[in-house]
């Protein structure tokens, strides 16, 4: 699996998980989260060559055209696969509030 | 939906489905595959700015991220999201076998 | 919250010999691939190298190639860049940043290490 545990240990050119750790503040302008500060939200990034951890039958075709046809810019691209919730607090008034935001931590990617 | 009656009329520069037509012996070098002798797969393409069709609450996140730091080249990417099937006559030997290959035709697209 | 100090740099002259350090601290060093960034005067931030999280795999810039060596010691959170046959070039702040730098350029998060290669 393109995961934490294979990614960040090879720290691969082809498609793979990178880490991301986003301020809430400073990196998307949003102060009504009391807690946490920021998460590891991670991302997807890297090439998908032909049968590097294809998702389905169509982006095994367009990674095979691809390499038959380096110049179409037609090639499958790295993205989310396993998502995970995050939960915060936050204060209405001066009611606390606690939320789990779903599909805020990506956990493994693939190429599609 | 980021599909064929929206984009194909749109020519979007962001996110959107594209035609491609693939020929399976020109492009794939397969030449297992009697008929069709090659089929309308299109593909996804295009920018993926903030709220554009965002698939999930990390897509949303990390378009954002994108925004507020244009260098850091971390942001979503234009993928498939309805597929669709290929029915295709191949021969073992004399004997026709018709298949239906699955997930082989791109409908719509989306921001993951 | 996630903290980056580096440190080690100076003045030294052509072809001479450098090491720099980060010392990391608010998360878990061990689980994250590191990299170093620079900035050289009135340019924009240039990924260096990068290290996986075990130290095993390693990649560098074409720039540093061969001169660089990036290494880490996961038992003192540290990270490390031993720069030999330093050139004019070279002069820049030097930052080390959390996860794989060639993908996302994040904001340095210390304050960085000067280096100035000069005769």
């Known amino acids: 699996a393109l995961d934490a545990a294979y990614c960040f240990r090879n720290v691969q050119d082809n498609c793979c998980l990178r880490p991301l750790y986003i301020d809430f503040k400073r990196d998307l302008g949003w102060k009504w989260i009391h807690e946490p500060k920021g998460y590891n939200a991670n991302f997807c990034a890297g090439a998908c060559p032909y049968l590097w951890s294809s998702d389905t039958q169509h982006s095994r075709v367009l990674s095979l055209y691809n390499t038959i046809n380096p110049e179409a810019s037609a090639s499958p691209c790295c993205v989310s696969q396993d998502l995970e919730p995050l939960t915060i607090l936050y204060y209405i008034g001066k009611t606390p509030k606690i939320e789990q935001l779903s599909n805020m931590i990506v956990k493994s990617c693939k190429c599609s | 939906a980021l599909d064929a009656a929206y984009c194909f009329r749109n020519v979007q520069d962001n996110c959107c489905l594209r035609p491609l037509y693939i020929d399976f012996k020109r492009d794939l070098g397969w030449k297992w595959i009697h008929e069709p002798k090659g089929y309308n797969a299109n593909f996804c393409a295009g920018a993926c700015p903030y709220l554009w069709s965002s698939d999930t609450q990390h897509s949303r996140v990390l378009s954002l991220y994108n925004t507020i730091n244009p260098e850091a080249s971390a942001s979503p990417c234009c993928v498939s999201q309805d597929l669709e099937p290929l029915t295709i006559l191949y021969y073992i030997g004399k004997t026709p076998k018709i298949e239906q290959l699955s997930n082989m035709i791109v409908k719509s697209c989306k921001c993951s | 919250q996630l903290q980056l100090v580096e440190s080690g740099g100076g003045l030294v002259q052509p072809g001479g010999s450098l090491t720099l350090s980060c010392l990391a601290s608010?998360?878990?060093?061990?689980?994250?691939?590191m990299s170093w960034v620079r900035q050289a005067p009135g340019k924009g931030l240039e990924w260096v190298s990068v290290i996986g999280s075990d130290g095993a795999i390693k990649h560098y810039s074409d720039s540093v190639k061969g001169r660089f060596a990036i290494s880490r010691d996961n038992a003192k959170n540290t990270l490390y860049l031993q720069m030999n046959s330093l050139k004019p070039e070279d002069t820049a702040v030097y930052y080390c940043a959390e996860g794989d730098s060639r993908y996302v350029r994040n904001r340095a998060r210390g304050q960085g290490t000067q280096v100035t290669v000069s005769s």
């Open positions: 608010g998360f878990t060093f061990s689980h994250y691939p």
